[in-house]
């Protein structure tokens, strides 16, 4: 059968029918349903929601919907022994204590099982000592402290403001600096937008609001006790001392009311420059310790959280493909939340739910996609991307042979200004073409395309008339699919205006105030931005699953490879003496990129011309496209990060959320001037150039004519 016969409806009608079936009102209804109680990973409430979603996806018409469970390491506060931080006087008396919980939002005062703010996976401990303010606790902040200001954090408790980088990187940096505890806080400079009221009167963070979150440094490992393998019934588990990525010092988060009390007494060195000052009425002195009158007072942490192996549940739905059932397009997003999950994750889960409903409606009318679509509701994302990673570990052999694409579906909104897309270069043209066909929801762009409003509000820094599309980093469930398995991946959501809003993320992120009302009152009352995101995510899945030729353009990879090679060469050339001394050459990399560009161009020409009615040739060409992303995987992984195997992209070693290009070379060059053995360090740079050049050349050859 031809593809059109197999799928009953003509391709153009399919896509239109699918998109027309998506309704803002349904997304609103689903969001309300998913946010009335907390759905913390490992709890009964989240298990019940998994079963509800399973049941509803079956009703919507999927072929099968199964729960996939794993027993993974999670972390919870001790219910009878709360975590807090004190200021103690010279006699050891607690003269100030931080709050034990966030004041609940109106209407939620009687909700039980709201987990108090905590840093997941913090070890237990009661360290006491002098405080050092370390700004955002980024690599460069510790360089400034240790190298320029000669401030030693060893044996100190550090206080860092949230923002700029993943909190796990902050904790790692503090550990490496010798700190014995970490206090994380939300500064109004980063989490309070000027001119907006605090929740419940606006979308800003109140002084008692606190950001929860895990502080692991897993580097893609998944469950800390079973790296590389699923945490199933017969799993061999590491001892806690050998667990991957656990922090070694106590960590606790606080709000800015409590932070004010700690920071207002700080003495020692003045802040090095204005970039170290937040918006509190405190001096932002670095310390160590408190100023004159308070110099005998210390800070003490009281952390009693426990790590527990706990059962988690993914929901996996299948819509079997009519023509290529052994080719999988995956739409996945997490279900677990820190509290109500008004934005993270349920604004995404509600969109996935509506996408499933729309696909189900088409299926009930006799349609099937060309390829199989898998839908996933992941568990324990907030605890380190555990549900998605364990499932991918369990199914890795199938995924590496059959995985066409993964589309992520966490929070649909982090603002309401414009679209934000991060994806593999293979999907650039898909995203461009799709957004040209969708209507913009933005004020002032009535009757205009989404592409037009997006390009106007978020222009590409390199190509005029095109929108910005960013590199994939991590911090979400696409990680295992892209960084470990090399499956083409993408994500889309509505975002803020980064130029006018300098706060990090959205102010109420991971707080108790992330409610349904936050979204319905302040972010998207008409749910039009949610609908647009549903159309983008759903439209991408539809095209990936249904187009006869996969909608991947390998020429776009050639363009970015050149850009990344230019960038890393420029970084390296900042050390010209060493480049000359150690004969460091980028010739092999530039040559490989040139070859890739030429071969990709020829492949694209063949793609236009081949006989699409020949199913063998069609499958062959599609397989070359599908396996191109896979060709960038190095089976040995990156140095000290075996589960980050993509040679072109990896999460930054300094910020898990950010993507880095040619990460092997980048990390080898990073701070190379401080290395004790320059010959060895530059030898590693040369080795990484070799690995990158080989990988690009090998990937190019997968696009050559097969014989």
């Amino acid at each position: 059968k031809s593809s059109n016969e197999a799928t009953n409806i003509t391709p153009k009608h399919n896509m239109k029918a699918f998109l027309d079936e998506l309704k803002a009102e349904n997304i609103k209804k689903f969001l309300y349903n998913f946010t009335q109680i907390p759905h913390l990973a490992g709890t009964e409430q989240n298990f019940q929601l998994a079963k509800q979603i399973q049941s509803q996806w079956k009703e919507f018409g999927l072929d099968s919907v199964e729960l996939a469970h794993y027993d993974v390491l999670l972390s919870y506060p001790n219910k009878t022994h709360p975590n807090y931080i004190s200021i103690i006087n010279e006699d050891g008396n607690e003269i100030f204590n931080t709050s034990l919980f966030e004041p609940p939002p109106p209407g939620y005062e009687n909700v039980s099982d709201i987990v108090p703010p905590f840093s997941a996976f913090s070890p237990q401990g009661m360290p006491e000592g002098d405080l050092v303010y370390v700004n955002y606790a980024r690599t460069e902040d510790f360089f400034k402290l240790e190298r320029d200001m000669k401030i030693n954090c060893s044996g100190k408790i550090v206080i860092a403001r949230y923002g700029k980088v993943f909190r796990g990187n902050k904790v790692k940096n503090a550990q490496l600096a010798g700190a014995k505890g970490v206090i994380l806080y939300s500064d109004p400079a980063d989490y309070f937008a000027p001119g907006v009221k605090s929740y419940p009167d606006g979308w800003n963070l109140p002084g008692g609001g606190v950001q929860r979150g895990n502080i692991l440094n897993l580097n893609g490992a998944g469950d800390p006790l079973t790296p590389g393998y699923p945490a199933n019934e017969y799993a061999y588990r590491r001892g806690i001392a050998e667990a991957v990525g656990l922090p070694s010092i106590p960590v606790h988060p606080i709000g800015y009311y409590d932070a004010q009390k700690l920071l207002e007494k700080m003495g020692g060195s003045a802040p090095p420059d204005s970039s170290w000052r937040g918006s509190l009425k405190v001096p932002y002195n670095v310390g160590p310790g408190f100023t004159g009158n308070f110099s005998t007072q210390k800070v003490k942490m009281h952390i009693h959280s426990t790590n527990e192996v706990t059962r988690i549940y993914n929901v996996i739905g299948t819509l079997r493909g009519a023509v290529e059932p052994d080719r999988y397009v995956i739409l996945g997003g997490h279900r677990d939340s820190w509290v109500f999950g008004g934005i993270d994750p349920q604004s995404g889960a509600a969109v996935v739910h509506e996408i499933v409903r729309s696909f189900g409606t088409l299926k009930k009318e006799g349609w099937r996609p060309r390829r199989t679509i898998l839908f996933a509701s992941w568990d324990a994302e907030e605890f380190g991307l555990l549900g998605s990673t364990e499932w991918a570990e369990e199914n890795s052999r199938l995924l590496q042979e059959r995985g066409v694409a993964y589309i992520n579906a966490d929070s649909s909104i982090e603002g309401n200004y414009t679209l934000r897309v991060d994806c593999t270069p293979l999907m650039y043209s898909l995203v461009h073409n799709l957004t040209k066909e969708l209507k913009s929801p933005d004020e002032g762009f009535e009757g205009k395309s989404l592409y037009e409003s997006w390009t106007k509000k978020s222009p590409s820094p390199e190509f005029s008339g095109m929108p910005r599309i960013s590199k994939l980093g991590s911090g979400n469930d696409f990680e295992v699919f892209f960084q470990r398995l090399g499956i083409a991946s993408g994500r889309a959501r509505y975002t803020k205006n980064w130029e006018t809003n300098k706060f990090s993320g959205y102010p109420l992120y991971h707080s108790v105030y992330e409610t349904y009302e936050l979204v319905e009152k302040f972010y998207d009352p008409m749910f039009k931005y949610h609908l647009t995101v549903a159309q983008v995510r759903g439209g991408m899945v539809f095209e990936l699953a249904n187009s006869i030729v996969l909608p991947f353009d390998c020429r776009d990879y050639a363009v970015v490879l050149r850009k990344y090679a230019d960038k890393i060469y420029s970084i390296s050339m900042k050390h010209p003496q060493e480049m000359k001394t150690y004969s460091v050459s980028f010739d092999s990399l530039f040559s490989a990129v040139k070859n890739f560009t030429e071969i990709a161009s020829k492949f694209s020409e063949r793609l236009q011309d081949f006989d699409k009615s020949n199913p063998i040739v069609l499958r062959m060409m599609n397989d070359q496209l599908m396996f191109l992303e896979r060709a960038f995987i190095d089976p040995l992984g990156l140095p000290d990060r075996p589960f980050y195997r993509h040679v072109i992209y990896a999460p930054s070693s300094h910020n898990k959320y950010a993507g880095e290009s040619f990460p092997g070379i980048y990390d080898a060059l990073f701070d190379i001037e401080s290395k004790v053995d320059p010959s060895k360090a530059w030898g590693e740079v040369k080795r990484q150039i070799y690995v990158a050049a080989f990988t690009v050349q090998a990937a190019a050859e997968t696009l050559s004519e097969v014989a």
């Epitope: 390199e462 090679a565 230019d566 960038k567 010209p576 050459s585 010739d587």
Partner: nanobody, 113 residues
């Protein structure tokens, strides 16, 4: 064989301008990022600027930012460095660099009153 030949150096007064050129041959010029590196008398090598495959992607040392402009003409296989508001501390031999290992012979720029 890769060849890089710099020209355009000379003596110039402080505040003056010069334009350096680097004629490239023996390789596919447009496929490579290129750089300028300088060496002041009695000093080590100092990176000045790099350029990618087009004139959009450029990078400069802080010491020359806003005064120097790197550019390229792929059709002529030539790299340029436009140097404005020259200072005495810009006095150096300026080298054109291909991939880290292929260097020109250099051209001397002297800034003096």
């Amino acid at each position: 064989e890769v060849q890089l030949v710099e020209s355009g150096g000379g003596l110039v007064q402080p505040g003056g301008s010069l334009r350096l050129s680097c004629a490239a041959s023996g390789f596919s010029f447009s496929s490579y990022a290129m750089s300028w590196v300088r060496q002041a008398p009695g000093k080590g090598l100092e990176w000045v600027s790099s350029i990618g495959d087009n004139n959009n992607s450029t990078d400069y040392a802080d010491s020359v930012k806003g005064r120097f402009t790197i550019s390229r003409d792929n059709s002529k296989s030539t790299l340029y460095l436009q140097m404005n508001s020259l200072r005495a501390e810009d006095t150096a031999v300026y080298y054109c660099v291909k991939d880290g290992v292929h260097w020109g012979q250099g051209t001397l720029v002297t800034v003096s009153s």
